[in-house]
């Protein structure tokens, strides 16, 4: 397939929640009027789906109601959030566009973004 | 064994409707990307249309756009082309045919396996 | 969209000789094609994808060659089992995916 560059962040730190956010730009060759956006994660030489989106230009993305993902888009950037993240999340997040409509179809995938998750320190027991 | 079995070919007049079915054996078909590939007789090969591995997804052929439509189910491992508004140009064997999909590159776009076609004929 | 012309439409050749048909495509496709062979009265069967990497169980006296708008597929010594019209197909810009016109090989 036709090939597009997709640029993301090398590395993003999750908040104290265990929400990261990044953002991810393609640079769409043609007037795409349907894309399609995944968050794939890689451990281990496995990769798997986290998420998935698509949307028509100017509008809003959607995520499945029991994803874990929200985003926005904004011309060819997409701001993506992950939420949820725990420390064993931890690993490469890989940003991956598809312009489904016009054809030609057209795939990028970007390098990844490392997602640090810490975990947060349970609060002390008080004595009051 | 791995295998598409393709049917619902027949005789229809110009103008009606008919459904194929191509079944699917052997793999896990809700991992490959599905397309259909006519043969009018005596002629060459004409890519007709593609769905995603999980249907996501369709594209056509312009000599075929708005009266095809092509549909999986994949609890029952089976592709479908509903063809409507069918003319004597459509007549061919009809070929499912199946295409590799890799999460990180997409649809490889060539066919690593084919049924043996199902024949169909529009004709008054 | 592109074109795929296929030369010769058919060649006849004797067992042992060796087989050139060419592909060219109307725009550079990299080495996005696939080679099928389709003998009489059967399906289709993948031999190359790539423009030359030789699909599993194809027999090493088949090959493929060529990038950009140029190909070739090369039967080193003719079988009468390479009896077949063969296809080129071009999916480096899909949809739409687009078939030569195919060449029949017989044996003399």
């Known amino acids: 397939c036709k090939a597009m560059h997709v640029a993301q962040p090398a590395v993003v730190l999750a908040s104290s929640r265990g929400i990261a956010s990044f953002v991810c730009e393609y640079a769409s060759p043609g007037k795409a009027t349907e894309v399609r956006v995944t968050v794939l994660r890689q451990a281990d030489s496995q990769v798997t789906e986290v998420c998935a989106a698509t949307y028509m230009m100017g509008n809003e993305l959607t995520f499945l109601d029991d994803s874990i993902c929200t985003g926005t888009s904004s011309g060819n950037q997409v701001n993506l959030t992950i939420q949820g993240l725990r420390a064993m999340d931890t690993g490469l997040y890989i940003c991956k566009v598809e312009l489904m409509y016009p054809p030609p179809y057209y795939l990028g995938i970007g390098n990844g973004t490392q997602i640090y998750v810490i975990d947060p320190e349970p609060c002390p027991d008080s004595d009051f | 064994q791995v295998q598409l079995v393709e049917s619902g070919g027949g005789v229809v007049q110009p103008g009606r409707s008919l459904r194929l079915s191509c079944a699917a054996s052997?793999?896990?078909?809700?991992?490959?990307?599905m397309h259909w590939v006519r043969q009018a007789p005596g002629k060459g090969l004409e890519w007709v249309a593609v769905?995603?591995?999980?249907?996501?997804?369709?594209y056509y052929a312009d000599s075929v756009r708005g009266r095809f439509t092509i549909s999986r189910d994949n609890s029952k491992n089976t592709l479908y082309l509903q063809m409507n508004s069918l003319r004597a140009e459509d007549t061919a064997v009809y070929y499912c045919?199946?295409?590799?999909?890799?999460?990180?590159?997409?649809?490889?776009?060539?066919?690593?396996?084919w049924g043996r076609g199902t024949l169909v004929t529009v004709s008054s | 969209d592109i074109q795929m012309t296929q030369s010769p439409s058919s060649l006849s050749a004797s067992v042992g000789d060796r087989v050139t048909i060419t592909c060219r495509a109307s725009?550079?496709?990299?080495?996005?094609l696939a080679w099928y062979q389709q003998k009489p009265g059967k399906v289709p069967k993948l031999l190359i994808y790539?423009?030359?990497t030789l699909q599993s169980g194809v027999p090493s006296r088949f090959s493929g060659s060529g990038s950009g708008t140029d190909f070739t597929l090369t039967i080193s010594s003719l079988q009468p089992e390479d009896v077949a019209t063969y296809y080129c197909?071009?999916?480096?810009?899909?949809?739409?995916?687009?078939f030569g016109g195919g060449t029949k090989v017989e044996i003399k």
């Open positions: 790539a423009a030359s």
């Open positions: 769905i995603w591995y999980d249907g996501s997804n369709k």
């Open positions: 052997g793999f896990t078909f809700s991992s490959y990307g």
């Open positions: 045919a199946r295409d590799r999909y890799d999460i990180l590159t997409g649809p490889y776009w060539y066919f690593d396996l």
């Open positions: 725009q550079g496709i990299s080495n996005y």
């Open positions: 197909q071009k999916y480096n810009s899909a949809p739409p995916l687009t």
